[in-house]
């Protein structure tokens, strides 16, 4: 295709003259205009003909072949699809054409999206055909293989596109180029029909990839850098397949100076130094291929950035507790930049920062440094400290922001009992939350163990962590390398920068939380009454383990007791417990004996089963009610007793047995099952009864006896009995005894509210007691009956019965309530019994 004209990435001129009939191809004139720059900065090749050397008379029935001209090639190639034998009637003014010829400006490029090749055809101002409506067609071909076809492609192989000439005498021709053919050579020629004449360009050739005109750069922005420069930055347009160079033009306009600059850079940013407060910066950028031919993009839209009267750099700092940071400032006041020596710094407009922390960087730049910073305490909605740069005593309302965060985040890890994963937890509760920040756990694994001092390695990996309901983040490492050191830290990412918590190194093998011991069993050993606890150690870890046992009475709130087992071979332990008959809950956990790792969870609780471990300690306390005529010899006696408590029954009572003994009938027993009441007929002079408690092991050995004796029921040793109401919950009963030859075993106190259809209440008390505090509910003005029965070895004596509270000394006894009653006062015993206890003595 050495016959084709290679299109350049700039504008060129197509010139057309009437043909000379003596030549097959018309001669090209010798004159070639110099490459001149047009207004918009593009370069154009102007090919012009000297029309005065050529004479022609008839323009009709003619196709004009036009040419481009270059120094190297003085030939014109014809488009293969040349139209012949067509007659055109020309209406053009021949003298004008004869003088000037017809000229068009042409510029072509590949659009930034790399899909369309565009050519613009524009009629030049001094064009005799300018006023005529013209049609433009572009014929093109993308040959498959260039090397095989040294000649011009044949007629019919060209495709034709109609160009759009709707705007301002500029026609737009669009050639679609497949992505795969961007590096191929595109052949094309133009046909312009105007004023009844066809003008045809020579064959043109182009590689579209060398004619790319990128879209303008995007996202133009400006910011003041931390070191006080103006950073202009932008993004390259999308889809560009090669690096670009950029032309940046900017102007600075301030009250003191106006400067303009134009710079070409290959990066997507440019630093401008010597920034001034209260200035306006206007910037535009365009782009062009960096390492080959191409066309400059259009300029981006202008972007304006105005600096404030006080410039802080950096304007905001995010840092961690204990660090040192510096702020710089340039202060403009009433169109004058304040001398840095006159600048004073304040914190939150409340405290002046000492001069010792200032540095004069230059005439206009002052610097303040903060050392060993403390955490910023939030003030209302403000989570930063405001740092003010002031002109002696005058402070501008603008300030710099200082965010100091305590990044001490504790990361705790544990390796599961199967040694398959390590779970690490951390919480942000300790650190001040900063809007816009994200937290991420980062880690680096060493091949073996941890270093003495963990450090943050530049190469690390992030770990996904998930927020749990307890406010902690949880991250799982799986699989794990037990003996690798995992150095980890929390990175706080924020638009102002990122901070790292102090790193910690964890060896999965050192944080193993074993599985809890299994097969935990608990039982109370018969006859001994010890709590025996047994367990099996978990399979992992294989290290020696220590065990911890907790045990306590089963219930809603268990009061645990702890017991440690340090012998790794131990599988059971027996412990003394105060109550053999209670249900004990037992749990076991374990931990490595060498102190490393964590305690396992507690095992599932094991519970003791309450079983009888011994015969009951004693039979129940009992009393009687005698029904029937007191004068009759035969009386119905109803025995009453409280169900035996567990600590006496050891641990249950299956049934009660009444043993009878009389002089006539000898001894016999009656099984009353689990009733707590039994009636029998008292017919003989003396009848002794004993109530035995029976459990699965046997019968109680220590039992209470009660002898019903006619002669003893007349023995009267209770001289007097008095009842003093202390308050509505306590009555003092006191008595005086007369001497007796009989062996006094104990007393029974009985009482009843005679105004109510309630029960008789009774208590057994020591024979040594002379005064007793009955705790129950009493209404002092209601009628009560109190009875005191002396119980002798030989039988039940005559009771003393009173129906009223004592009338004398009531006040004195009420005052007694305030005093501590001595053992002597109480005859050696002060019995306090609750209503609940009393209930067991009640008889309905």
């Amino acid at each position: 295709f050495n016959l084709s004209y290679p299109i350049t990435p700039w504008r060129f001129k197509l010139s057309c003259m009437p043909p000379n009939s003596t030549y097959d191809y018309f001669l090209l004139p010798a004159g070639l205009s110099k490459n001149t720059s047009n207004l918009n900065g593009h370069y154009e090749t102007a090919v012009e003909f000297n029309s005065s050397d050529t004479h022609f008379s008839n323009l009709s029935k003619t196709t004009f072949h036009c040419c481009f001209r270059s120094e190297q090639d003085r030939n014109c190639s014809l488009c293969a699809d040349n139209i012949e034998g067509k007659t055109f009637v020309s209406t053009v003014n021949s003298s004008v054409f004869q003088q000037m010829g017809a000229n068009w400006n042409i510029q072509c490029w590949l659009k930034g999206d790399l899909k369309l090749f565009i050519c613009y055809v524009e009629s030049l101002f001094k064009n005799p055909f300018k006023n005529y409506k013209h049609k433009v067609h572009l014929l093109y071909v993308l040959p498959e293989v260039l090397e095989d076809s040294p000649l011009v492609p044949q007629k019919g192989s060209f495709q034709m596109v109609h160009c759009n000439c709707s705007v301002h005498e500029r026609c737009e021709c669009l050639v679609p180029v497949p992505t795969a053919k961007l590096n191929d050579t595109l052949l094309m020629c133009l046909k312009i029909t105007s004023g009844g004449v066809i003008f045809q360009s020579p064959l043109m050739s182009v590689q579209p990839i060398n004619m790319v005109k990128p879209d303008p750069p995007l996202g133009l922005r400006m910011e003041i850098t931390d070191d006080g420069n103006l950073k202009i930055s932008w993004s390259s347009p999308p889809l560009v397949p090669f690096p670009l160079q950029y032309e940046v033009k900017y102007s600075e306009n301030s009250t003191t100076v106006i400067r303009e600059a134009d710079k070409i850079v290959s990066a997507t940013s440019l630093l401008v130094d010597g920034i001034l407060p209260g200035s306006s910066y206007e910037v535009q950028v365009r782009g062009k291929r960096l390492d080959g031919p191409g066309i400059w993009s259009d300029w981006s839209t202008p972007h304006v950035f105005t600096t404030q009267d006080v410039i802080y750099f950096p304007p905001k700092i995010l840092t961690s507790v204990g660090s040192n940071v510096s702020f710089h400032c340039i202060y403009k006041n009433e169109n004058k930049i304040v001398s840095s020596k006159k600048i004073v710094w304040w914190m939150n407009l409340a405290e002046k920062i000492p001069q010792s922390q200032y540095d004069v960087v230059s005439d206009h730049v002052s610097k303040v440094t903060f050392f060993n910073l403390n955490e910023t305490k939030p003030r209302g909605k403000f989570t930063y400290d405001a740092v003010y740069c002031c002109n002696e005593h005058e402070c501008h309302h603008r300030y710099a922001e200082l965010y100091v965060i305590d990044v001490n985040i504790n990361i705790s890890c544990e390796t599961d009992g199967h040694l398959t994963k390590m779970t690490c937890r951390w919480s942000t509760n300790t650190i001040q939350s900063l809007a816009g920040s994200t937290l991420q756990l980062r880690y680096r694994r060493s091949s073996l163990y941890c270093f003495d001092i963990p450090s943050i390695h530049p190469i690390s990996k992030p770990k996904d962590c998930y927020l749990q309901s307890d406010g902690f983040y949880e991250c799982v490492f799986q699989p794990i390398f037990l003996l690798s050191g995992y150095t980890m830290w929390i990175r706080i990412n924020h638009p102002l920068g990122s901070l790292d918590s102090p790193p910690t190194c964890v060896l999965p093998d050192s944080v193993v939380k074993p599985l809890p011991p299994s097969s935990v069993k608990a039982e109370i050993i018969k006859n001994i009454g010890l709590l025996k606890i047994s367990w099996e150690k978990p399979v992992f870890p294989e290290n020696n383990l220590q065990f911890q046992i907790r045990y306590g009475l089963s219930g809603k709130e268990i009061q645990w007791k702890m017991y440690d087992v340090y012998d790794a071979k131990s599988k059971s332990v027996s412990l003394p417990v105060p109550d053999f008959c209670a249900v004990y809950a037992v749990q076991v956990r374990c931990k490595r004996s060498d102190g490393l790792g964590l305690w396992s969870n507690w095992s599932n609780p094991a519970y003791t089963v309450v079983m009888d471990i011994k015969v009951p300690m004693r039979g129940p306390e009992f009393w009687r009610i005698i029904n029937g005529d007191t004068m009759k010899k035969e009386k119905n006696v109803t025995l009453l007793w409280k169900p035996l408590m567990k600590n006496d029954s050891l641990c249950s009572v299956q049934r009660y047995v009444i043993n009878h003994h009389t002089s006539c009938n000898g001894t016999w027993s009656e099984d009353v099952g689990n009733h707590t009441k039994f009636t029998f007929l008292w017919t003989e002079q003396a009848h002794t009864v004993t109530v035995l408690a029976i459990n699965s092991i046997g019968a109680s050995v220590a039992n209470f006896n009660l002898t019903f004796s006619w002669p003893m029921s007349k023995v009267n040793i209770v001289q007097s009995l008095s009842a003093y109401p202390l308050n509505s919950s306590c009555v003092i009963l006191s008595w005086i005894l007369s001497p007796s030859d009989y062996k006094l075993m104990y007393f029974i106190i009985e009482w009843k509210n005679l105004n109510e259809d309630g029960e008789i209440k009774w208590l057994r008390i020591s024979s040594s007691v002379k005064k007793y505090y009955i705790h129950d509910h009493f209404i002092p003005i209601e009628k009560y009956q109190f009875s005191l029965y002396p119980i002798f070895m030989e039988g039940v004596g005559k009771p003393k019965i009173i129906n009223s509270f004592a009338q004398d000394n009531t006040e004195k006894h009420q005052n007694d309530e305030q005093k501590l009653i001595s053992e002597e006062d109480l005859g050696g015993e002060q019995k306090l019994i609750s209503e609940e206890d009393l209930h067991h003595h009640h008889h309905h």
Epitope: S729, N755, H777, P780, I781, S804, Q807
Partner: antibody, heavy 117, light 108 residues
Framework: EVQLVESGGSVVRPGESLRLSCAAS????????MSWVRQAPGKGLEWVSG????????VYADSVKGRFTVSRDNAKNSLYLQMNSLRAEDTALYHC??????????WGQGTLVTVSS | DIQMTQSPSSLSASVGDRVTITCRAS??????LNWYQQKPGKAPKLLIY???SLQSGVPSRFSGSGSGTDFTLTISSLQPEDFATYYC??????????FGQGTRLEIK
């Protein structure tokens, strides 16, 4: 049928005295303690005094302690309330009641005492 | 002294309604609480003793419940003769016996 009938209520001046009586019938009087309960016009019930079945124990509300004395005559099945140093705030309908269940199971219709200058 | 507080102070209801009156003690009084009914110009009448025991001769539509500090008197189906003032009274700590301020039950 248990019956309690109060008497002795009248209009008196502040500082004066008055003795109320309550005649009981229909039950064994000396088996029960007795109480006086008053009710100021349009107000609620206020316990005043109590006496045990045999008169051995007497109890009073703080508001009347030292001014009122309760007594009984079991032979006459009668209950009394001696009211001295009367005040305007003592104006009320005075009920006698049989003591039971820590309260009162039978009440008289009441006698009106008005203390006014 | 133990204070007794009744609520509501008054309430309107219709015949056949189920009505609940509550009484609260300033400290625990176990089950030592009585309920009384008083009609205008009449002497009070004992309804319930020991928090839940029905006094003989009182209709079974009256019931009491509660222990400790909170107690309720319930009338399951209000009858015309039930419109009256109701009082609660504690007998836990005596003397003194203390009453609630009363709840007036009136026809809607």
């Amino acid at each position: 049928e248990v019956q309690l009938v109060e008497s002795g209520g009248s209009v008196v001046r502040p500082g004066e005295s008055l003795r109320l009586s309550c005649a009981a019938s229909g039950f064994t009087f000396d088996d029960y303690g007795m109480s006086w309960v008053r009710q100021a016009p349009g107000k609620g019930l206020e316990w005043v005094s109590g006496i045990s079945w045999n008169g051995g124990i007497t109890v009073y509300a703080d508001s009347v302690k030292g001014r009122f004395t309760v007594s009984r005559d079991n032979a006459k099945n009668s209950l009394y309330l001696q009211m001295n140093s009367l005040r305007a705030e003592d104006t009320a309908l005075y009920h006698c009641a049989r003591a039971r269940y820590g309260g009162a199971d039978y009440w008289g219709q009441g006698t009106l005492v008005t203390v006014s200058s | 002294d133990i204070q007794m507080t009744q609520s509501p102070s008054s309430l309107s209801a219709s015949v056949g309604d189920r009505v609940t009156i509550t009484c609260r003690a300033s400290q625990s009084i176990s089950s030592y609480l009585n309920w009384y009914q008083q009609k205008p110009g009449k002497a009070p009448k004992l309804l319930i003793y020991a928090a839940s025991s029905l006094q003989s001769g009182v209709p079974s539509r009256f019931s009491g419940s509660g222990s400790g500090t909170d107690f309720t008197l319930t009338i399951s189906s209000l009858q015309p003769e039930d419109f009256a003032t109701y009082y609660c009274q504690q007998s836990y700590s005596t003397p003194p016996i203390t009453f609630g301020q009363g709840t007036r039950l009136e026809i809607k």
